[in-house]
Structure formats: C-alpha cells, structure tokens
C-alpha cells in the first residue's frame, strides 16, 4: 500500500477513501511533494498582506505587503513600514538620518558616511541624508597641471553639503 | 485609544435568533487592511473563531457554523454585526470581537485588540 | 480546517520556574502562528506574533520559537501574574483556529 502512495505526484494526494487512489488536491489547498497522505490548506493573503502569488496545486501562495509596506520575517509573516530614502525606521516612526548617515534604501538604517581619509583619498562628491560621499584620489596623485579637473573638495570629514 | 465593544441579549432562548453588535472605535472599518473576527467562548472551554470579515465585504465562516451565522458591517456605524439562528444550550458563550490588521511600525495579521466580551446564555 | 494541539493541557510551575509550551498544527504553515494569554474573566491578551515576534508591552520573559508545524511559548522565569491559560492560533488562512489551551496553575 506504501508504494501505491509514493506514485502520486505533486498536487495530489493519497486518497484512503478510495483504496489509495491519487486524487486532485481540493481547491484551496496543495501538495508541493510526492507521496502525500493529505493535501495542505493554502496561505491566504488578506488584509495587511496582498498575493504576490496565487496557490496552486503544487506550491503555496506567497504574499506580498500592502503599499507603504515591506516583508519581514520567514516567508512574510509581517509587514514593516517604508520609509523615504535619507530616513531610517524607529519603534515611532521614519526618522531623518542624523548628520554624517545616509540610507539610499526605503528599509534599513542610517549608516555612516564613508571616511575617505582612511584610504588616504579626498572627498570627491559631499554626502547628503541619501547618498553617501564619493571618495576621489589623494590629493598627491593630481600631479600639478595635469588635468583641469574641479579641485577635489576641502578633506572636511566626513563631507556634507547644505541639507 | 483603540476600544471594541459587544454588545447584545444576555439571554436567549432555544430556536432564537442571536443578534449581536461589535462596536469599535479609534479605528475606521473602511480601512483596507483592517479584519474583524468574531469568537467565543463556552464555560471552561477554548476560544472558537466563527466569522471574519474584512474592509471589502469579504467574508470567513466557520465550516461547523457557516450555516447559521451572517456577519455585516455599517462603517457609518462604526459596527460589525453577527446573527446566529437556531440557538441551542450548547451555544452559551461568551460572544468576543477582535481586530486584526494593526497600525504602526510593524503590522500583522493577529487579533491585537479583543472587546471584553459578552456573555450569551440559551435557556428556556 | 487547520487544527491545533497544546501540550500539556494543565501544567503546575512555582514561581521562577522556566515554562514551554507545544503547539502543534496538522499541517505546516511556516511561521504564521500567534499566542495570547488569557486571565479569568478577561479577554484574550495578544503575546507573539510571527511565532516569535514580541506584541509591543510585553515583558521579555516571553519568546516564541518554531515553524512549520511545532512551535513553543517559552516563559523564563515564571512571574505571579502568569498563571493564566494560554492559546495558540494559526496565522496561515480563515477561519483563524486556536488549540484547545494550556492552564498554568500555581503549584
């Protein structure tokens, strides 16, 4: 009878109703391996979540958060607020990076500007909330009169401009 | 501040239909990610979820209740109402609503706030 | 439906005491899986979300852990005003379910 079982495929099941018959896996529910004495009840993705995608008789639904919202967890068991690029979240809410942070992502948080002067290098573009600074070559390896290139920025660390 | 509220007859008698409404405040029914379940409690005994509805109509019903049990809302109202026919001694419970669907930093979908119940008792 | 089972229905613990409880579901469903605690009289109090996500407020001495189909609510170091009865419920599709709950009495 075990090996009557194992020949039912992916989207069926085991049916011991019926003499172990491989049957159609109900509606609303899957079997994602061979063999299997039931079929499972797929995730249904309501309220603060969204279906990313849709059940079927081999695989799972996978869902997605609603807008304004992103993924955490395994397999998306929450949602965790968006914030705006040059914020990071807080237990109450987006928060604007501090001087000297930045975040180019709607998730994560503020990390701190690159040290140019630590790779013996100049600040070539200034940091802002969203990006970081852009570390250009040491002041020694312009050679004088060599290019007509916009003078690196003064090695104020670490760079910003004007928010 | 978030609060539910139940509210309905204390008694009932058997082949009556029960009424009950869930009054909620602090929170907007039309809110698309926000649910509202009904559940009870028998004397001693464990929770059981009966119905569920959400901000689009969208209904859940217990496969041993579906029957018996209808669920509407009035978002004018602030209210979710639950009707359950053909009432037996077996349904005395206390009758809880609960939301799901929080608001904040990080949101899910487990009941965060319950109402503080009431009791439904069916006699004759 | 999705069905629940606790283990132990009722469970004596002294105060300190570490205290886990099982709960199992018929079918896996990841980690979508949530606990509350439940006093006399009271309503349903929500704990872990996520399986193991902490609801805002609650002390640290509770965590949650598993996925799939076993899970447990672990109590550190058992406080007086823990003796409650405590419930799990399936996050993975409607209607919600819950397990038949787990009474933890003072010993």
């Known amino acids: 009878l075990q090996d009557l079982c194992s020949n039912c495929p992916a989207g069926t099941f085991c049916d011991n109703n019926r003499s172990q018959i491989c049957s159609p896996c109900p509606p609303n529910s899957f079997s994602s391996a061979g063999g299997q004495r039931t079929c499972d009840i797929c995730r249904q993705c309501k309220g603060v979540f969204k279906t990313r995608k849709e059940c079927s008789s081999t695989s799972n639904a996978e869902c997605d958060c609603i807008s304004g919202y992103h993924c955490l967890g395994a397999e998306c068991s929450m949602c965790e607020q968006d914030c705006k690029q040059g914020q990071e979240l807080t237990k109450k809410g987006c928060k604007d990076c501090c001087f000297g942070t930045f975040n180019d992502q709607k998730r994560g948080i503020c990390r701190p500007w690159t040290n140019c002067s630590l790779d013996g290098k100049s600040v070539l573009v200034n940091g802002t909330k969203e990006r970081d600074v852009v570390c250009g070559p040491s002041p020694a390896d312009l050679s004088p009169g060599a290019s007509s290139a916009t003078p690196p920025a003064p090695a104020r660390e670490p760079g910003h401009s004007p928010q | 501040q978030v609060t539910l509220k139940e509210s309905g007859p204390v008694l009932v008698k058997p082949t009556e239909t029960l009424t009950l409404t869930c009054t909620v405040s602090?929170?907007?029914?039309?809110?698309?990610?926000?649910?509202v379940s009904w559940i009870r409690q028998p004397p001693g005994k464990a929770l059981e979820s009966l119905v569920h509805i959400f901000s689009n109509d969208e209904k859940f019903f217990s496969t041993s209740l579906k029957s018996r049990l209808t669920i509407s809302k009035d978002t004018s109202k602030s209210q979710v109402v639950l009707t359950m026919t053909n009432m037996v001694p077996v349904d005395t419970a206390t009758y809880y609503c609960a939301r799901n669907g929080g608001f904040g930093v990080i949101i899910h979908d487990a009941f965060d706030i319950w109402g503080q119940g009431t009791m439904v008792t069916v006699s004759s | 439906d999705i069905q629940l089972t606790q283990s132990p229905s009722f469970l004596s613990a002294s105060v300190g005491d570490r205290v886990t409880i099982t709960c199992r579901a018929s079918?896996?469903?990841?980690?979508?899986l949530a606990w509350y605690q439940q006093k006399p009289g009271k309503a349903p109090k929500l704990l872990i979300f996520a399986a193991s996500t902490l609801q805002n407020g609650v002390p640290s001495r509770f965590s949650g852990s598993g996925s799939g189909t076993e899970f447990t609510l672990t109590i550190s170091s058992l406080q007086p005003e823990d003796f409650a009865t405590y419930y799990c419920?399936?996050?993975?599709?409607?209607?919600?379910?819950f397990g038949q709950g787990t009474k933890v009495e003072i010993k």
């Open positions: 079918q896996g469903i990841s980690s979508y």
């Open positions: 419920q399936q996050l993975n599709n409607y209607p919600r379910t």
């Open positions: 602090g929170f907007s029914l039309s809110n698309a990610r926000v649910g």
